[in-house]
């Protein structure tokens, strides 16, 4: 009884099972009751990559340099030629029949995966903490500069397209130091005023004073380490000394007691 189905690597023809031709060979004649399937090897520029009953081998793919293609792997009687693209180009499709230039990632985007001969550049948006300020087919998103590690402070925040701008710490320190210095000055001034008040109210135990001309009291004379001859410097900006202005006495005139 003739078979209705055949084993693997066989095919049914004229009510009998014939062997398929192995990869790299084409069918010349089907098997008969007396002979096996006749197969012949594919020629130099041809191939067949499966067990088959093809009467013609397939032509190897041509990697056309005019389309930016070059041979990645030479074809055999069992495999097709594999084409790839020249440097800087990638295949337009899976079959790689022509090539196109790699895409560049715009500013704000970095390269997630560098393009190959068969795949385009894959870009990704730069996440927070990273930036890209160039249009490139190779550069990844770069991390923002760390101002702290350079003993600097952030003067301008970074974006996905720009790096942070770092600056010296002065301004920031000044914001803390100035109020502290002013506070200290204020306390000193207060103490001085209290001291002056006390000195001014001190009674004279010896003889009653005759009426005197108003006199200047140098309240700095009693302060330890003070030089009455030296002008007092104001300390204002960031505790930096400010030079005494010319034509101004550094003494405070005190009104004569009544």
């Amino acid at each position: 009884e003739p078979p209705t189905a055949c084993r693997e690597k066989q095919y049914l023809i004229n009510s009998q099972c014939c062997s398929l031709c192995q990869p790299g060979q084409k069918l010349v004649s089907d098997c008969t009751e007396f002979t096996e399937t006749e197969c012949l090897p594919c020629s130099e520029s041809e191939f067949l990559d499966t067990w088959n009953r093809e009467t013609r081998c397939h032509q190897h793919k041509y990697c056309d340099p005019n389309l930016g293609l070059r041979v990645q792997q030479k074809g055999t009687s069992e495999t097709d030629t594999i084409c790839t693209c020249e440097e800087g180009l990638h295949c337009m499709s899976e079959s790689c029949e022509s090539c196109v230039p790699h895409r560049s990632c715009l500013p704000g985007f970095g390269v997630k995966q560098i393009a190959t001969g068969v795949s385009d550049t894959i870009c990704e948006p730069c996440p927070v903490g990273f930036f890209s300020n160039v249009s490139s087919a190779f550069e990844k998103c770069r991390p923002w500069t760390s101002c702290e590690t350079k003993d600097l402070v952030v003067q301008q925040a970074g974006t996905n397209k720009t790096d942070v701008v770092c600056g010296p710490q002065d301004r920031q320190r000044a914001l803390v130091v100035i109020p502290i210095c002013l506070g200290i000055l204020f306390v000193i001034l207060l103490l001085v005023l209290v001291f002056i008040k006390k000195v001014a109210k001190k009674p004279n135990d010896k003889a009653p004073h005759p009426k005197q001309e108003p006199q200047e009291i140098n309240f700095l004379d009693d302060l330890p380490g003070s030089n009455p001859a030296a002008p007092v410097q104001e300390t204002l900006h960031g505790c930096q000394p400010v030079t005494q202005e010319d034509g101004k006495e550094s003494r405070i005139s005190v009104q004569e007691r009544q």
């Epitope: 062997s19 004649s29 008969t32 009751e33 002979t35 096996e36 006749e38 012949l40």
Partner: antibody, heavy 112, light 112 residues
Framework: QVQLEQSGDDLVKPGASVKLSCKAS????????INWIKQRPGQGLEWIGR????????HYNEMFKGKATLTVDTSSSTAYIQLSSLSSEDSAVYFC?????WGQGTTLTVSS | DIVLTQSPLSLPVSLGDQASISCRSS???????????LEWYLQKPGQSPKLLIY???NRFSGVPDRFSGSGSGTDFTLKISRVEAEDLGVYYC?????????FGAGTKLELK
């Protein structure tokens, strides 16, 4: 119906060459191998060789290499056997066959 | 080369008898695809051989069912259940599995 029509009987001189033909009809010529068989008077059957009309591939019995050359002409569906340097040993009936069908045979006589 | 040994070389029978012819090969004639190309032919005097059995046991079209083939590997048998007058002649076994293809020496079926 399948038929294999062989050329007529031949008488040739020793040392000469001869080309016998076998014209196929009633089937696709390229589908079946053509075998050539030799039978000397009162003897058994000897396989000379075979040819695939589809590819031109040939297989020979070592004993007949250099003696027999098998060819085909697919345009006329005809197979040929050329026998060279003939001697009386080559006197025999030559059959062409595709196994299930046989030609009627050609009697070759080599004699001076 | 594969040698096919037939026995007996001569088989005298009476019409209506059962006849059995053996064919032994010097090595297995199962080919790489698992096929056994063993055939049986009958040649009557002055005629071309005719195919009876192919692939060990398959009867060729038009062959009476009194002919049957069996065997495997290296041992094969042709049986004729009831011999008729038209069955007389020389029977050849033939192997087409391995080149060079070979015939047995033949068994002559004749009347007692």
């Amino acid at each position: 119906q399948v038929q294999l029509e062989q050329s007529g009987d031949d008488l040739v001189k020793p040392g000469a060459s001869v080309k016998l033909s076998c014209k196929a009809s009633g089937y696709t010529f390229t589908t079946y191998w053509i075998n050539w068989i030799k039978q000397r008077p009162g003897q058994g059957l000897e396989w000379i060789g075979r040819i695939s009309p589809g590819s031109g591939s040939t297989h020979y019995n070592e004993m007949f290499k250099g003696k027999a050359t098998l060819t085909v002409d697919t345009s006329s569906s005809t197979a040929y056997i050329q026998l060279s340097s003939l001697s009386s040993e080559d006197s025999a009936v030559y059959f062409c066959t595709r196994n299930d069908y046989w030609g009627q045979g050609t009697t070759l006589t080599v004699s001076s | 080369d594969i040698v096919l040994t037939q026995s007996p070389l001569s088989l005298p029978v009476s019409l209506g008898d059962q006849a059995s012819i053996s064919c032994r090969s010097s090595q297995s004639i199962v080919n790489s695809n698992g096929n056994t190309y063993l055939e049986w032919y009958l040649q009557k005097p002055g005629q071309s051989p005719k195919l009876l059995i192919y692939k060990v046991s398959n009867r060729f079209s038009g062959v009476p069912d009194r002919f049957s083939g069996s065997g495997s590997g290296t041992d094969f048998t042709l049986k004729i259940s009831r011999v008729e007058a038209e069955d007389l002649g020389v029977y050849y076994c033939f192997q087409g599995s391995h080149v060079p293809l070979t015939f047995g020496a033949g068994t002559k079926l004749e009347l007692k």
